[in-house]
């Protein structure tokens, strides 16, 4: 079955997958798609990439690592509920029925906003859940707390930063990964 | 999937307080979210708020913030919605409904409980 | 708070025929929209979530379609079983809202 990976709304959500190429530069065509991989392609693509670069993807849709030595983990921008699902990693090696598939679930909650002591603001009314997040680790809490002379848009990107160190870290080591050639 | 359970009906008196429960069984109670729904004819559907059973977190409507309470007693596999200070308005049916693997927050819903407000 | 608006409030329609119901947000809601089916004097039955897909059970005569702020329930082939209450719920952002329900009356 699926191996199931998890974040909360507002986060970007990581979803690992790994190839080793044969040789550095020597890159294999991978897919992204939602829902269980098919038999051939992926359906519903949001990501593609070629031997060389990556010829398509959709808003929210990217590859952090370093997809030129394999690393073709997908990262999915500020998640909501509807973001769940089954996720298709397709490694796409020349042959015959020789693709690598990773079916990989993603379950999104709600998120969990510890009360900050200071004032908020009104700025919790757009952004309700952007204050504080609770992590994945063992009682693991980080807080943004209260910040004075700071937009949404900045607040939404330094606790997006804080998620994607935090979960690229916990979640690298346990990706689907293969060696080519 | 699992089963929901509610009683059917209570009756209580103005400016007193009623707890609903919400009896789960057939599924790991604490793996998924519980939401409040509050239905009055002719008024709609109103989200009351929501709980993760696995460590109490909760979140409400703000316009129930002082009126309803949601707690679990994951012993028994229950959730609870406590509602004070009765006035007719508060006369209702109210549901439990639970999320579904993929997150969806509505999947499956208790029977409800008619709630009347009566002196 | 998003508002969602449903429509039409009520439809008679015959057994066979397809039908859609509508459900407008005032916002981007980003397919994080459910279906609900309320029949008469009982609670509620989840049919679709995420816009466009069908919860466990659910006949494949339901579908949901739908991006940005508009969205659809479409049953086709109604059936004696279908003639109920529907319900569109929206939550992308809280407080979760409701559509204020279409009727499925039989012509």
């Known amino acids: 079955s699926e191996v199931e990976y998890r974040a909360e709304v507002g986060q970007n959500a990581y979803l690992p997958c790994f190839y080793t190429p044969a040789a550095p530069g020597n890159l294999v065509p991978v897919c992204w798609g939602k829902g269980a991989c098919p038999v051939f392609e992926c359906g519903n693509v949001v990501l593609r990439t070629d031997e060389r670069d990556v010829n398509y993807w959709t808003s929210r849709y990217w590859l952090n690592g370093d997809f030129r030595k394999g690393d073709v983990s997908l990262t999915i921008e500020n998640v909501t509920l509807a973001d769940s699902g089954i996720y298709c990693c397709r490694i796409q090696i020349p042959g015959i029925m020789n693709d690598e598939k990773f079916n990989l679930k993603l379950v999104i909650k709600p998120a969990k906003v510890t009360p900050a002591p200071t004032r908020q603001r009104d700025f919790t009314a757009a952004f309700p859940r952007m204050l504080t997040t609770r992590g994945h680790g063992p009682a693991e809490t980080q807080t943004l707390g209260s910040l004075p002379d700071i937009n949404l848009t900045q607040i939404s990107t330094l606790a997006n930063e804080l998620r994607d160190s935090r979960l690229a870290n916990d979640l690298r080591d346990s990706g689907a990964t293969i060696r080519i050639g | 999937q699992g089963q929901l359970q509610q009683p059917g009906a209570e009756v209580v008196k103005p400016g007193a307080a009623v707890k609903l429960s919400c009896k789960a069984s057939g599924y790991t109670f604490t793996s998924y979210w519980m939401q409040w729904i509050k239905q009055r004819p002719g008024q709609g559907l109103e989200w009351i708020g929501e709980i993760d059973p696995s460590d109490n977190y909760t979140d409400y409507n703000q316009n129930f913030k002082g009126k309803a309470t949601l707690t679990v007693d994951t012993s028994s596999s229950t959730a609870y919605l406590q509602l004070s200070s009765l006035t007719s308005e508060d006369s209702a049916v109210y549901y439990c409904a639970r999320e579904g693997a993929f997150s969806s927050p509505f999947a499956y819903w208790g029977p409800g409980t008619l709630v009347t407000v009566s002196s | 708070d998003i508002l969602m608006t449903q429509s039409p409030s009520s439809m008679s329609v015959s057994l066979g025929d397809t039908v859609s119901i509508i459900c407008h947000a005032s916002?981007?809601?980003?397919?994080?929209i459910g279906w609900l089916q309320q029949k008469p004097g009982k609670s509620f039955k989840g049919l679709i979530y995420?816009?466009?897909n069908l919860e466990d059970g659910v006949p494949s005569r339901f579908s949901g379609s739908g991006s940005g702020a508009d969205y659809s329930l479409t049953i086709s082939s109604l059936e004696s079983e279908d003639f109920a209450d529907y319900y569109c719920v929206q939550y992308v952002q809280f407080p979760r809202t409701f559509g204020g329900g279409t009727k499925l009356e039989i012509k």
């Open positions: 995420h816009g466009t």
């Open positions: 916002q981007d809601i980003r397919s994080n």
